[in-house]
């Protein structure tokens, strides 16, 4: 499958439009601070070069690797040292070290202004004036803020973004048509980014084996009728796709993802009965649809697992012959029987099984030693079940906002050293598990909840890794990928934490709070709540509720006042004193 010119190969496979879009995404994900115009210029230069290679694959430099070509292009940016500091040192390295260096400098929390949505008429005018630039700008803004966004999926988002403007800018009520669509794209985009970030973290921090185990479990749940060999082939191909995308090889990734979708659709009969509709769609929609497809029905006649994995006299022999294949089969068989389990639970069970075999196959009587291995699974299964039951009850009692607040308090007490914006963002997202998953029946709750929590806790881990402040966070994030959630759940109040000095400035508010959206106002209140806990980690929920009630009343009163700013100043002083009284500061 060797090509004289890799860049010509990918240009021909992907087509000019997708080629340009993917190169723009790649560059924006690497150089997150560069202006849009600079990136467009670089992309155009690369595209013109690619066209010369398509015309003549033997032309000068056409035989170079994509990393070499793209890296050389990025290193022509004049302001590299001023804008990126030590990232400029990457340019002194040779491939593949140079690309690794660029990858290490990707910033999960870049210092970029919040994207403010212009008026609908302004957006529609910009869309009509220059559709191509408008859509490129979308790719650029998302890619630079989400440097691990799954590039082929971002093309799908851009296609939907374009469709929304095409339809709504002609509508009678443009805003009513467009705004809900943009909100949906924004929310789905954030979720997609976070899910992909976990895949990249799995590969980069825990290795290919960890990712493959995750993929075996998930695909076995999704395609329970498929043979183990078929699932294994899909896992190998999917791992290649995600390794490429996480490694910045976006052209190869998009190309291989298209090939995988093609393969799945050509082999539907041996994979899943649920793929028919997906496979009738165009490429980007097809790939997205396959990735989200519902679980197929389980085969009716699946035998007990115990026969092959506990009762058989050949367990240790089969394990010794090919450990990972045998464990992969165990994971496949367990997962296809348990769509009601989270992937991380299935991986914990597989790890327990592996640990037991490692111990028992070296024992005098292996069978006697591992005979009760399935009994060890019971507490592992019950722990997330009980946790989800308790938290869904709490969510139903409190509603989303107050449930988020309960989690804010819980997590601030566990890891008070973490920055307030990170605690607010992560706890708000943890709290969304309620609306997302608690509505599901029992059989769907755990895969929904625990796998979603894995995604959110990974956000905490990647943000914390940038500026580590808590040994407890580092420990939970690095020790075991599948035990991150139980590790955080097990944390109690951090007794070593020295409370923050009380600073009245933190609790000083102004009239601008009155014009904020409900969501932004919630974030202000939740930020204050985290700060209160940091000042008084042992505050009871009664104390915190009392202060938050005062705060809500204070905002309501001053936002109704004629002279809002004076009210915020005078009543604000009282609020600070009242909060100190309530908390005993």
């Amino acid at each position: 499958d060797a090509h004289k010119s890799e860049v010509a190969h990918r240009f021909k496979d992907l087509g000019e439009e997708n080629f340009k879009a993917l190169v723009l995404i790649a560059f924006a994900q690497y150089l997150q601070q560069c202006p849009f115009e600079d990136h467009v210029k670089l992309v155009n230069e690369v595209t013109e070069f690619a066209k010369t290679c398509v015309a003549d694959e033997s032309a000068e430099n056409c035989d170079k690797s994509l990393h070499t070509l793209f890296g050389d292009k990025l290193c022509t940016v004049a302001t590299l040292r001023e804008t990126y500091g030590e990232m400029a040192d990457c340019c002194a390295k040779q491939e593949p070290e140079r690309n690794e260096c660029f990858l290490q400098h990707k910033d999960d929390n870049p210092n970029l202004p919040r994207l403010v949505r212009p008026e609908v008429d302004v957006m529609c005018t910009a869309f009509h004036d220059n559709e191509e630039t408008f859509l490129k700008k979308y790719l650029y803004e998302i890619a630079r803020r989400h440097p691990y966004f799954y590039a082929p999926e971002l093309l799908f988002f851009a296609k939907r973004y374009k469709a929304a403007f095409t339809e709504c800018c002609q509508a009678a009520d443009k805003a009513a048509c467009l705004l809900p669509k943009l909100d949906e794209l924004r929310d789905e985009g954030k979720a997609s980014s976070a899910k992909q970030r976990l895949k990249c973290a799995s590969l980069q921090k825990f290795g290919e084996r960890a990712f493959k185990a995750w993929a075996v479990a998930r695909l076995s749940q999704r395609f329970p009728k498929a043979e183990f060999a078929e699932v294994s082939k899909l896992v190998t191909d999917l791992t290649k796709v995600h390794t490429e995308c996480c490694h910045g090889d976006l052209l190869e990734c998009a190309d291989d993802r298209a090939d995988l979708a093609k393969y799945i659709c050509e082999n539907q009969d041996s994979i899943s009965s649920k793929l028919k509709e997906c496979c009738e769609k165009p490429l980007l929609e097809k790939s997205h649809c396959i990735a989200e497809v519902e679980n197929d029905e389980m085969p009716a006649d699946l035998p007990s697992l115990a026969a092959d994995f506990v009762e058989s006299k050949d367990v240790c022999k089969n394990y010794a012959e090919a450990k990972d294949v045998f464990l992969g089969m165990f994971l496949y068989e367990y997962a296809r029987r348990h769509p009601d389990y989270s992937v991380v639970l299935l991986l914990r069970l597989a790890k327990t099984y592996e640990t037991t075999l490692e111990k028992c196959c070296a024992a005098a009587d292996p069978h006697e030693c591992y005979a009760k291995v399935f009994d060890e699974f019971k507490p592992l299964v019950e722990e997330p079940q009980n946790l989800i039951k308790q938290n869904c009850e709490l969510f139903e009692q409190l509603g989303e906002y107050k449930f988020q607040n309960a989690l804010l308090v819980r997590y601030t007490k566990k890891v008070p050293q973490v920055s307030t914006p990170t605690l607010v963002e992560v706890s708000r997202n943890l709290g969304k598990v309620g609306s997302k998953c608690c509505k599901h029946p029992e059989a769907k709750r755990m895969p929904c909840a625990e796998d979603y929590l894995s995604v959110v806790l990974n956000q905490l881990c990647v943000l914390h890794e940038k500026t580590p402040v808590s040994d407890r966070v580092t420990k939970c994030c690095t020790e075991s990928l599948v035990n991150r959630r139980p590790c955080f759940s097990a944390l109690e109040v951090d007794e070593t934490y020295v409370p923050k000095e009380f600073n009245a400035e933190t609790f000083t508010f102004h009239a601008d709070i009155c014009t904020l959206s409900e969501k932004e106002r919630q974030i202000k209140k939740q930020t204050a709540l985290v700060e209160l806990v940091k000042h008084k980690p042992k505050a009871t929920k009664e104390q915190l509720k009392a202060v938050m009630d005062d705060f809500a009343a204070f905002v309501e009163k001053c936002c109704k006042a004629d002279d809002k700013e004076t009210c915020f100043a005078e009543e604000g002083k009282k609020l600070v004193a009242a909060s100190q009284a309530a908390l005993g500061l």
Epitope: A546, D549, D550, A553, F554, E571, K574, L575, V576, A577, A578, S579, Q580, A581, A582, G584
Partner: nanobody
């Protein structure tokens, strides 16, 4: 700086009643949050009750149903009515508001 003075503490048998009062000089309690906290020997200070800026009252779980907080605007005084006292209620009781603390009043409950 506002001065806060607590009074009304003393020795009482378990099951008995006391009324603590807190008087503020230099400011009025109305529209300002105030709280009672207590500290037992060798223990950390703990929250007892709070009257918020809108007069909403919050009690610690351990005293709910036994203690009542009230305010007398004419005398600029706040009262903590303590009924059905338990040995575990033995502590120095402090009043706090306006960023100030009183000097505390001792409550001792004997069995």
């Amino acid at each position: 700086q506002v001065q806060l003075v607590e009074s009304g503490g003393g020795l009482v048998q378990a099951g008995g009643t006391l009324r603590l009062s807190c008087t503020a000089s230099g400011s009025t309690f109305r529209g300002n949050g105030m709280a009672w906290h207590r500290q037992a020997p060798g223990k950390e200070r703990e929250f007892v009750a709070y009257m918020g800026m809108t007069d909403r009252i919050t009690y610690a779980e351990s005293v709910k149903g036994r203690f009542t907080l009230s305010r007398d605007d004419a005398k600029n005084r706040v009262y903590l009515h303590m009924n059905n006292l338990e040995v575990e209620d033995t502590a120095v009781y402090y009043c706090t508001a306006f960023g100030s603390w009183g000097q505390g009043t001792q409550v001792t409950v004997s069995s």
